[in-house]
C-alpha cells in the first residue's frame, strides 16, 4: 500500500493489499476501501463502468464478467485499484467484438482473460486460416491483444483470441479486423475539360473526381478570388476497399459574362492537397475569328502549285465554310478540319490547293465561314508571275519601230543593235518611247508594255533584238535591216526564244 | 539495441534440474517478448517457451509443459528457464532471443530479431 509523507493528502489503502486478486466463478468478491475522505468505488472491464458509493465493495456470487479493475478513489481525487479475476473455465475471455485498426498503428483486439494462469495467450486465424506472417502483438491479460503496426493487407483478416487449457487450445469469439487506411499520397484529382466556353444563357456543369484510399477525403470547388460557396452535388463509390472515389459537379444554370473565370477543384487528406482548375469564359453572343497561315498577297510562278491555308476559332461550331474565286464557288480541291480532336477545340484549318496555276488564274480567292450567330470572310490576292511574251514587232509607218510585250511582272523591253553579220547583240539603243497599256483581261493579269526605237539611226546592215526579260523569264525579237542604195530594206522580223 | 547474454549451463544427470537466466542489457524497454529456443546436433532450433515482459503471459509447446517454466525478474532484467526432469534428448545449446513484440507464429525463431551466444546444456544417462 502507498506511503506518504505526513500532512499530505494519501491515496485511499485497499484490502486485500494486492495488486491482482483471483477468484473463482460463484465465490464472493469483498473489496474494502479505507480513507477518511472515501468518496466512490469504480469497476471498469472493457467500455462498462459501474459505480458505488459503499467503502466495501461486496459481490456475492462472481461471475466472469465480474473480471475487471476496481478503483476506490478519495475526495482529493487520490485513488488506488485493485484488478480482480473471476476464473471461470466456461468463459475464459471477455470480448468487445468491434475491431478497426488504423493502418500503421497500433490496435486492441480486446479479449481480456478471466484466468491469467493460463498460456499460449496469442491470435489465431479463422477455420484454421493462417494468420499474416509479418502480424506482430504485445499480449496484455488485462486487456487484449494489441496488433502492431496493422498493415492495410489486414483488413477483414478473421481472428480468435486463443489460450492453451488442460492442453487445447480454446478460442474466443471471432473478431473482423477493419483497417482504416493511412493516406500516403495526395488524393488524385481529375476535371472533365480544362476549359468550357459558352454563350450567355447556357448551362455550365463540370465534374471534378477526386480518388483516394478513403472516403475521409475532403474536396471542394472554389472559385478563385472569390469566398464565395458554390453549389455542387456528389456522388460516390467504393471500387473494392481501398479505392474511393467522388465526383463533385458544380452547376451554373443560366451562366453570365460575369460568371467567366477560374473554377478550382480543391482535395486534401492528411498527406497533403491536390487541385485541378476549370477556365470558364461566358460570350454574349458567337463568334468568328480568321488568322491567314500565309500572306494574304500571294505571288507564285506559272505552272507552279501554291496552297492558301487559314485557320480560324468559331464558337458555336462552323456550318458552312466555302472557298471562292471569280463569283465560282469551288466544289472541290479544299478541305477544312478541326485543329484538335479534343472536345473543346474551336479552332479550325481550311486549306485551299491551287495547281498548275495559268497565268490567266490569278485574281481574288475568298474563303467564307459562318456559324449560327455570325458570318467572316477573308480574302487572298493570287499573283501569277509569267515570262514575257511579244505580243507585237513591227515597222510604223514613221519609221519607228515598236515592241508590245506581256508578262507578270511588269516586263523591261530592252533594244539592242547587231552590226554586220555578228551574232551577239550587245549595242544598246535607247528607246524614244515606252508606254505600259491597260490590259484587256481580268486584274491580277500580264501587264502590257509597248517601247518604240527610231530606225533612222541605224546606217548599217544588221539586226535589231527587241528584248523582253522580268524575274520570270526573257524573250527576244528581231528586226533584219539591208541597204541596198540609199534604200533600207525591213527583212521580215522573227523572235527567238531566250530561256 | 538490446544485448543478451545466457548463462547457467553445464552438465546435469538425467532426472535433474537446471535453471538458465538470460541477462538483457540495453535498450529492453522496448522489447515485450522475450523467449528461449534450442538446437541440438544437426537439428532445427526449436522454440521452448516464451514470456510477455509487460504482461506476464507464458508460452510453451506442448511438448515442453509441466517440466520447463519461464519466469521474468523486471529488476534484473533477467528472464530464467527452470528446467525440471531432464533427460538426454534434452541436450542442446538454449538460446535466448527477443523482440520488440511477438511474432503471430511465436514459436518460429526466424521472426525473432535479438540473439544470445547460446549456454549448451547436457543431459547424461
Known amino acids: 500500500q502507498p506511503s506518504v509523507s505526513p500532512g499530505e493528502p494519501s491515496p485511499p489503502s485497499i484490502h486485500p493489499g494486492k495488486s491482482d486478486l483471483i477468484v473463482r466463478v460463484g465465490d464472493e468478491i469483498r473489496l474494502l476501501c479505507t480513507d477518511p475522505g472515501f468518496v466512490k468505488w469504480t469497476f471498469e472491464i472493457l467500455d462498462e463502468t459501474n459505480e458505488n458509493k459503499q467503502n466495501e465493495w461486496i459481490t456475492e456470487k462472481a461471475e466472469a464478467t465480474n473480471t475487471g479493475k476496481y478503483t476506490c478513489t478519495n475526495k482529493h481525487g487520490l485513488s488506488n485499484s485493485i484488478y480482480v479475476f473471476v476464473r471461470d473455465p466456461a468463459k475464459l475471455f471477455l470480448v468487445d467484438r468491434s475491431l478497426y485498426g488504423k493502418e500503421d498503428n497500433d490496435t486492441l483486439v480486446r479479449c481480456p482473460l478471466t484466468d491469467p494462469e493460463v498460456t499460449n495467450y496469442s491470435l489465431k486465424g479463422c477455420q484454421g486460416k493462417p494468420l499474416p506472417k509479418d502480424l506482430r502483438f504485445i499480449p496484455d491479460p488485462k486487456a487484449g491483444i494489441m496488433i502492431k503496426s496493422v498493415k492495410r493487407a489486414y483488413h477483414r483478416l478473421c481472428l480468435h483470441c486463443s489460450v492453451d487449457q488442460e492442453g487445447k487450445s480454446v478460442l474466443s469469439e471471432k473478431f473482423i479486423l477493419k483497417v482504416r487506411p493511412a493516406f500516403k499520397a495526395v488524393p488524385v484529382v481529375s476535371v472533365s475539360k480544362a476549359s468550357y466556353l459558352l454563350r450567355e444563357g447556357e448551362e455550365f456543369t463540370v465534374t471534378c473526381t477526386i480518388k483516394d484510399v478513403s472516403s475521409s477525403v475532403y474536396s471542394t470547388w472554389k472559385r478563385e478570388n472569390s469566398q464565395t460557396k458554390l453549389q455542387e452535388k456528389y456522388n460516390s463509390w467504393h471500387h473494392g476497399d481501398f479505392n474511393y472515389e467522388r465526383q463533385a459537379t458544380l452547376t451554373i444554370s443560366s451562366a453570365r459574362v460575369n460568371d467567366s473565370g477560374v473554377f478550382m477543384c480543391y482535395a486534401n487528406n492528411t498527406f497533403g492537397s491536390a487541385n485541378v482548375t476549370t477556365t470558364l469564359e461566358v460570350v454574349d453572343k458567337g463568334f468568328i475569328n480568321i488568322f491567314p497561315m500565309i500572306n494574304t498577297t500571294v505571288f507564285v510562278n506559272d505552272g507552279e502549285n501554291v496552297d492558301l491555308i487559314v485557320e480560324y476559332e468559331a464558337f458555336p461550331k462552323p456550318e458552312h465554310q466555302q472557298w471562292i474565286y471569280m463569283n465560282r464557288t469551288f466544289t472541290d480541291k479544299w478541305e477544312d478540319y478541326p485543329k484538335s480532336e479534343n472536345e473543346s477545340n474551336i479552332r479550325y484549318v481550311s486549306e485551299l490547293h491551287l495547281t498548275r496555276l495559268k497565268g490567266t488564274e490569278g485574281g481574288t480567292y475568298t474563303f467564307l465561314v459562318s456559324n449560327s450567330d455570325v458570318n467572316a470572310a477573308i480574302a487572298f490576292n493570287v499573283y501569277v508571275n509569267t515570262k514575257p511574251e511579244i505580243l507585237t514587232y513591227d515597222r510604223l509607218v514613221n519609221g519607228m519601230l515598236q515592241c508590245v510585250a506581256a508578262g507578270f511582272p511588269e516586263p523591261t523591253i530592252d533594244w539592242y543593235f547587231c552590226p554586220g553579220t555578228e551574232q551577239r547583240c550587245s549595242a544598246s539603243v535607247l528607246p524614244v518611247d515606252v508606254q505600259t497599256l491597260n490590259s484587256s483581261g481580268p486584274p491580277f493579269g500580264k501587264l502590257v508594255v509597248q517601247s518604240s526605237i527610231d530606225s533612222s539611226a541605224f546606217k548599217h546592215n544588221g539586226t535589231v533584238e527587241c528584248k523582253a526579260y522580268n524575274d520570270v523569264g526573257k524573250t527576244s525579237a528581231y528586226f533584219n535591216f539591208a541597204f541596198k542604195g540609199n534604200n533600207k530594206e525591213q527583212i521580215h522580223p522573227h523572235t527567238l526564244f531566250t530561256p | 539495441e538490446v544485448q543478451l547474454v545466457e548463462s547457467g549451463g553445464g552438465l546435469v544427470r538425467a532426472g535433474g534440474s537446471l535453471r538458465l537466466s538470460c541477462a538483457a542489457s540495453?535498450?529492453?524497454?522496448?522489447?515485450?517478448?522475450r523467449a528461449w529456443f534450442r538446437q541440438a546436433p544437426g537439428k532445427e532450433r526449436e522454440f521452448v517457451a516464451a514470456?510477455?515482459?509487460?504482461?506476464?503471459?507464458?508460452y510453451y509447446p506442448n511438448s515442453m509443459k509441466g517440466r520447463f517454466t519461464i519466469s521474468r525478474d523486471n529488476a534484473k532484467n533477467t528472464v530464467y528457464l527452470q528446467m525440471n526432469s531432464l533427460k538426454p534428448e534434452d541436450t542442446a545449446v538454449y538460446y535466448c532471443?527477443?523482440?520488440?513484440?511477438?511474432?503471430?507464429?511465436?514459436?518460429?525463431?526466424?521472426?525473432?530479431?535479438?540473439w544470445g551466444q547460446g549456454t549448451l546444456v547436457t543431459v547424461s544417462s
Open positions: 532471443a527477443a523482440d520488440e513484440s511477438f511474432p503471430a507464429y511465436y514459436s518460429d525463431y526466424a521472426l525473432y530479431r535479438y
Open positions: 540495453g535498450r529492453t524497454f522496448t522489447y515485450d517478448a
Open positions: 514470456i510477455s515482459w509487460s504482461g506476464g503471459s507464458t
